[in-house]
Amino acid sequence: QKSSIEKCSVDIQQSRNKTTERPGLLNCPIYWQQLREKCLLFSHTVNPWNNSLADCSTKESSLLLIRDKDELIHTQNLIRDKAILFWIGLNFSLSEKNWKWINGSFLNSNDLEIRGDAKENSCISISQTSVYSEYCSTEIRWICQKELTPVRNKVYPDS
């Protein structure tokens, strides 16, 4: 039995997967900030987690996925205000009793040190210094991401 949050996450991810292939993104759009091979958009307004998820989807992006501790730190360095929290694309899966990224993968327990409980209707936010479990209904800001397409140099075999 999936929670409404899980279902929302799955529905949006599936609808994103169904969309036609678009040309790769070479530069970040206006108002988006580049962080390595990603473009990040930090919202100014606040919303519950599911609305934030849906908003990123309308922007042909997703809530932020963080690969590892290093990416977390680099993202946190972009947050200007100490006390501000931002939703990312990670929430608690009641059916699997584990933290689950919106792309379907599970959290590697070493990646993020989460403050707070792992329980139903919990979603993950980040601040300048920490990672928090919050009620998904809490209205805070959020971070959307778009992947940049790497420009590959052609490698020719030795002649």
């Epitope: 108002y31 100014h44 307004t45 606040v46 609305n51 908003d55 309308t58 922007k59 200007r80 205000d81």
Partner: antibody
Framework: QVQLQESGPGLVKPSETLSLTCTVS????????WSWIRQPAGKGLEWIGR???????NYNPSLKSRVTMSVDTSKNQFSLKLSSVTAADTAVYYC???????????WGQGSLVTVSS | QSALTQPPSASGSPGQSVTISCTGT?????????VSWYQQHPGKAPKLMIY???KRPSGVPDRFSGSKSGNTASLTVSGLQAEDEADYYC??????????FGGGTKLTVL
Amino acid sequence: QVQLQESGPGLVKPSETLSLTCTVSGGSISSYYWSWIRQPAGKGLEWIGRIYTIGTTNYNPSLKSRVTMSVDTSKNQFSLKLSSVTAADTAVYYCARDPLGSFFDYWGQGSLVTVSS
Amino acid sequence: QSALTQPPSASGSPGQSVTISCTGTSSDVGGYNYVSWYQQHPGKAPKLMIYEVSKRPSGVPDRFSGSKSGNTASLTVSGLQAEDEADYYCSSYAGSNNLVFGGGTKLTVL
């Protein structure tokens, strides 16, 4: 180049509902938020509210009880309804693109709405 | 949620610098780095000049700059030109997804 165009009646009777539509051209409505701002003659700007393309709305607390906004992404349009209008609602009404929720980078040319019997 | 306070008028001669202030509270200007400034010529729609306190959209001359200290934001126009004569409005995010504008300042180029 993104362009916004307000349309709707220029004259509304007191106690009736003011209705305006903003048509967005030169870009998709889906990736941004959209706001309504008004300006009485010779006075300052007042933010009325914003709508997200997912349908969520935020309204100015002073107008919240009378305002309704909606969006039609298929037509690249969003709309404003302001109920129970009085002469104090007479103003130029602007629609604007609200990229992140705190500023407006593209504006319509404005639509003068007069409330009078 | 009251309007931000701006001086009703400001003036300067061509080539001079003029600074327009915008005073709010810790709930709006002081609490967020989300102050913007707009220029409005008579009969025209406002035009974004500064956003997020000090960022300039493309196409806006670098004569326009923004800053903030405490609960007061400022717009400075250096090297005043005749076409800078207009009304200027500040705006700030005010928490809970609300926005508030200033009352406007009429800038006269002498």
